[in-house]
């Protein structure tokens, strides 16, 4: 029998390579039972993790999960760092993993990108 | 039934590159890390790198960095492993393994492994 | 990296007896999580590597639980309380908590 507890499905470790000045969505997959939980998004500074409150978020509804969606319209080079999803669900505290984002300025990159970028932005192998 | 099916076995020339291959069932490659382990004949294990399929993000032991790419397909839950200038240093077995279930993400499902040999 | 160091290299056990092997590691392996990510593999002969034991002292389904892994920080040990035929091969720890990932050198577990 599956559990019933919200789950927050971030990996543990997980990295996104990412460009200033483009469009990004970090996504929370949320899994919950009957009523939707509150869920927010944090930005880990030192020990602390930063309640982002004026951020563009959203909900996309899938059959099996949810994704509660940080916006970047566009990514800053000060987003670089480490972000991780809360839920309250039946007043517990769930928190997710944390989830890091390398941010590449373009304006500072060299013209021949990591291996990792490549890797992680498939759209730059002409294979 | 979780399971790893890796390609069959190569043969290959010095100087040469090879592309194995490594698709899974059983679960989505996307909700996990799929990892490469090399072992040379006769000797222990060694970890190659991992790569998150669902955006395509790397990491390496640094002493691979040169020598080997990941790729992963979600469409054909199919991980790959390009390894890349041969010598006879990398004549071993490569497994692919399963980066394990949430919330942990440590290895357990082990492919069967593929058996490269460089020789001329 | 993170060293994996395991002794002894090679164990030669009587099926019946027990048998401990020792796996320490250079650095602290417990993560900001407040896990620690050590697991213990078995790779029988000719076969892949199979995990046995995963965040230290988990046993994995079907693992019998004359299989005991224990330690924390730097220090970890398997413990077989009763060895059987079927468990000869070559036991390697490997570390999750840092990268790059690594593994021990392994400990040949062989039947007297």
């Known amino acids: 029998k599956e559990s019933c507890d919200v789950q927050l499905y971030i990996k543990r470790q997980s990295e996104h390579s990412i460009l200033a000045g483009d469009p990004f969505e970090l996504e929370c997959p949320v899994k919950y039972c009957a009523n939707r939980p509150h869920v927010t998004w944090c930005k880990l500074n030192g020990t602390t993790c930063v309640k982002l409150e004026d951020r563009q978020t959203s909900w996309k509804e899938e059959k099996n999960i949810s994704f509660f969606i940080l916006h970047f319209e566009p990514v800053l080079p000060n987003d670089n760092g480490s972000y991780r999803c809360s839920a309250n669900f039946q007043s517990n505290l769930i928190e997710s993993h944390s989830t890091t984002l390398y941010v590449t300025d373009v304006k500072s990159a060299s013209e021949r990108p990591s291996k990792d970028e490549m890797a992680s932005r498939p759209w730059l192998l002409y294979r | 039934e979780v399971q790893l099916q890796q390609s069959g076995a190569e043969l290959v020339k010095p100087g040469a590159s090879v592309e194995l291959s490594c698709t899974a069932s059983g679960f989505n490659i996307k909700d996990t890390y799929i990892y490469w382990v090399k072992q040379r004949p006769e000797q222990g294990l060694q970890w190659i790198g991992r790569?998150?399929?669902?955006?395509?993000?790397?990491k390496y032991d640094p002493r691979f960095q040169d020598k080997a790419t990941l790729t992963a397909e979600i469409s054909s839950n199919t991980a790959h492993l390009q390894l890349n200038s041969l010598t006879s240093e990398d004549t071993a077995v490569y497994f692919c393994v399963r980066g394990g279930d949430h919330p942990y993400y440590v290895m357990d499902w082990w492919g069967q492994g593929t058996s490269v040999t460089v020789s001329s | 990296a993170v060293v994996m160091t395991q002794t002894p290299l090679t164990l030669s056990v009587t099926i019946g007896q027990p048998a401990s092997i020792s796996c320490k590691s250079s650095?602290?392996?417990?993560?900001?999580?407040?896990?620690?990510?050590l697991i213990w593999l078995l790779q029988r002969p000719g076969q892949s590597p199979m995990r046995l034991i995963y965040?230290?002292?988990k046993l994995d389904s079907g693992v019998p639980d004359r299989f005991t892994g224990s330690g924390s920080g730097t220090d970890f040990t398997l413990k077989i309380s009763r060895v059987e035929a079927e468990d000869l091969g070559i036991y390697y720890c490997?570390?999750?908590?840092?990268?790059?990932?690594?593994f021990g050198g392994g400990t040949k577990l062989e039947i007297k």
């Open positions: 490997w570390q999750g908590t840092h990268f790059p990932r690594t």
């Open positions: 650095q602290n392996l417990l993560d900001s999580d407040g896990k620690t990510y």
């Open positions: 790569i998150d399929p669902a955006n395509g993000h790397t």
């Open positions: 965040l230290v002292s």
